[in-house]
Interface confidence: medium
């Protein structure tokens, strides 16, 4: 569809509320340091301009592309050079280079203060005083901290945020009603952001073929009754949606996502029996529901795959005629039969199958050469199965906090050059796999665990790319998307690492430790643990456990003392000396 005015087209399609929300998200994700009021001003100017184009599509500048309009608007920010440094150079470029330049300057770890949650009464007053501003502030604060957040999904989070306040600010016990809802939104939001970041990394670093392969596998698991051509249609449309959102084209992305939801709901019969309850919901909820929908039941009469992909004499002929389609059909057929496998495992199997065909179809006797290809899958399948089994046993034995600590030690030994805050963040999140996945039935454990780990390890890769310090991390992150997790799992103690010099300051603690929340206390202790391992990478589990137990006892003792600060000042150096002796 060609429209005289793209901005008018999107305004009409999306409606004013969603249009304004998406433009605010787009601007906040590009200019992450700009004050809220500045962004609101820019959004209002764009919205007023869009309205003039709706009234007259031939009006001046209405024919310009959205990138041109939005880029021009961003480049009017007066403090661009002072606030963003070299990002201001983007404004000297022409489209499409200017937009690419803005994208490259998105910061996954912006230097922004953690969001502090005010008192419930303060929040409710702000909500009632100016609901629109309150919700815009939410979009702004989330978007600037998560510059790749899936924009149409962020509108859904904002709608839930609004509903929570509308309900709970009327409740007798506002806090009891609101705080659990806000906690849930925060946790779900962080998970959603991390999942989308992997999709964007997949598209940007490995190309749309990698993303399409992921989508074929995942959608074939979800919709095992759908034809291959149907799955392919959904994959093509979904790839367009995510390519747009990852590229900053948020209006097009939201519009196309709505079209995809409409298509799925109009074609439920050829997709899945599970879509019905999603399709009765309003747009934002419907799209979210469709994205999260459970796997449909597998057809009962699926024949063996071996007939078409191993035993057939036409395997090489079919492969040669259209490699990507044949491999796509193989992946579709394998995935729809294996909802119990992780998507990453399915992609490894497809890769192994492709490698075998590349080798065997050039051999003297191709059929003889590829006859045992499915046997070669066995070790690939067993590796993640064993990993999940061992780690779930460890999680059940230790509990979440100590399981996180085991992972902190494991990963610090593998890649000690990585910054301590990154190791703590990533290992804590890796450790959450236990509570998330280990309680599930056997058939759901691997897809839950390995695909979650892929998301968490992508965060490590994204942070490391910004400040590269380890060749091992770079290698695991860049060589193969599907083999990232096995690559990290296979890393051993870095023998080349020169231990970090001991710094007593790192292990000096104060009375403020006692007022921290349980989570903040854990982070402090885990930070110390990482520093210990960096100082003594060859320390045994027993040595580290001894030091950490002493640390916990020391903190507990001083937090019970009358003069806490004096206790920390006196007991701290003793703890440090005892720790050094224990690790000598």
């Amino acid at each position: 569809d060609t429209h005289k005015s793209e901005v008018a087209h999107r305004f009409k399609d999306l409606g004013e509320e969603h249009f304004k929300g998406l433009v605010l998200v787009a601007f906040s994700q590009y200019l992450q340091q700009c004050p809220f009021e500045e962004h609101v001003k820019l959004v209002n100017e764009v919205t007023e301009f869009a309205k003039t184009c709706v009234a007259d599509e031939s009006a001046e500048n209405c024919d310009k592309s959205l990138h041109t309009l939005f880029g021009d608007k961003l480049c009017t920010v007066a403090t661009l050079r002072e606030t963003y440094g070299e990002m201001a150079d983007c404004c000297a470029k022409q489209e499409p280079e200017r937009n690419e330049c803005f994208l490259q300057h998105k910061d996954d770890n912006p230097n922004l203060p953690p969001l502090v949650r005010p008192e419930v009464d303060v929040m409710c007053t702000a909500f009632h005083d100016n609901e629109a501003t309150f919700l815009k502030k939410y979009l702004y604060e989330v978007a600037r901290r998560h510059p790749y957040f899936y924009a149409p999904e962020l509108l859904f989070f904002a709608a839930r945020y609004k509903a929570a306040f509308a309900e709970c600010c009327q409740a007798a016990d506002k806090a009891a009603c609101l705080l659990p809802k806000l906690d849930e939104l925060r946790d779900e939001g962080k998970a959603s952001s991390a999942k989308q970041r992997l999709k964007c990394a997949s598209l940007q670093k490995f190309g749309d073929r990698a993303f399409k392969a992921w989508a074929v596998a995942r959608l074939s698991q979800k919709f095992p009754k759908a034809e291959f051509a149907e799955v392919s249609k959904l994959v093509t449309d979904l790839t367009k949606v995510h390519t747009e959102c990852c590229h900053g084209d948020l209006l097009e992305c939201a519009d196309d996502r709505a079209d995809l939801a409409k298509y799925m709901c109009e074609n439920q019969d050829s997709i899945s029996s599970k879509l019905k309850e999603c399709c009765d919901k309003p747009l934002l909820e419907k799209s979210h529901c469709l994205a999260e929908v459970e796997n449909d039941e597998m057809p009962a009469d699926l024949p063996s795959l071996a007939a078409d992909y191993v035993e057939s004499k036409d395997v090489c002929k079919n492969y040669a005629e259209a490699k990507d389609v044949f491999l796509g059909m193989f992946l579709y057929e394998y995935a729809r039969r294996h909802p119990d496998y992780s998507v990453m495992l399915l992609l490894r199997l497809a890769k192994a199958y492709e490698a075998t065909l590349e080798k065997c179809c050039a051999a003297a006797d191709p059929h003889e050469c590829y006859a045992k290809v499915f046997d070669e899958f066995q070790p690939l399948v067993e590796e993640p199965q064993n990993l999940v089994k061992q780690n779930c046993e460890l999680f059940e034995q230790l509990g979440e906090y100590k399981f996180q600590n085991a992972l902190l030690v494991r990963y610090t030994k593998k890649v000690p050059q990585v910054s301590t805050p990154t190791l703590v963040e990533v290992s804590r999140n890796l450790g959450k796999v236990g509570a998330k996945c280990c309680k599930l039935p056997e058939a759901k454990r691997m897809p839950c665990a390995e695909d979650y780990l892929s998301v968490v390890l992508n965060r490590l890769c994204v942070l490391h790319e910004k400040t590269p310090v380890s060749e091992k991390v770079t290698k695991c992150c860049t060589e193969s998307l599907v083999n990232r997790r096995p690559c990290f799992s296979a890393l051993e103690l870095d023998e080349a690492y020169v231990p970090k010099a001991f710094n007593a300051e790192t292990f000096t603690f104060h009375a403020d430790m006692c007022t921290l929340s349980e989570k903040e206390k854990q982070v402090k202790k885990q930070t110390a643990l990482v520093e210990l391992v960096k100082h003594k990478p060859k320390a045994t589990k027993e040595q580290l456990k001894g030091v950490m137990d002493n640390f916990a006892a020391f903190v507990e003792k001083c937090c019970k003392a009358d003069d806490k600060e004096a206790c920390f000042a006196e007991e701290g150096p003793k703890f440090v000396a005892a720790s050094q002796a224990a690790l000598a």
Epitope: E227, F228, A229, S270, D308, D314, E333
Partner: nanobody, 119 residues
Framework: EVQLLESGGGLVQPGGSLRLSCAAS????????MLWVRQAPGKGLEWVSV????????YYADSVKGRFTISRDNSKNTLYLQMNSLRAEDTAVYYC????????????WGQGTLVTVSS
């Protein structure tokens, strides 16, 4: 009863063009993915192109990519194949077929239309 009727074949010189049509009846065309397959003299069936029920996406065999275009008109229950830059090796009987629910097999196909590329 499913019926697929191909037309538009004929003799054409190398580098020339042809447009094949396939009229479908007896099934719900607009919910069916369709494809073109061909059989060269003395050879097996080779699939040429697939089109989803909605018109996108489309897929092509590597041997025809960039030269052939598959399309459909659901209001007329008709499938098309525009063939440009024809080569001698494109000589074959072309069949339109209803795409299968899976695997490289075809549920129904027509009687075919012969395309001969020769100078």
């Amino acid at each position: 009863e499913v019926q697929l009727l191909e037309s538009g074949g004929g003799l054409v010189q190398p580098g020339g063009s042809l447009r094949l049509s396939c009229a479908a009846s007896g099934f719900t065309f607009d919910t069916s993915s369709m494809l073109w397959v061909r059989q060269a003299p003395g050879k097996g069936l080779e699939w040429v192109s697939v089109i989803h029920q909605s018109g996108t996406p489309t897929y092509y065999a590597d041997s025809v990519k960039g030269r052939f275009t598959i399309s459909r008109d659901n209001s007329k229950n008709t499938l098309y194949l525009q063939m440009n830059s024809l080569r001698a090796e494109d000589t074959a009987v072309y069949y339109c077929a209803k795409f299968p629910s899976s695997r490289m097999k075809f549920d129904y196909w027509g009687q075919g239309t012969l395309v001969t590329v020769s100078s």
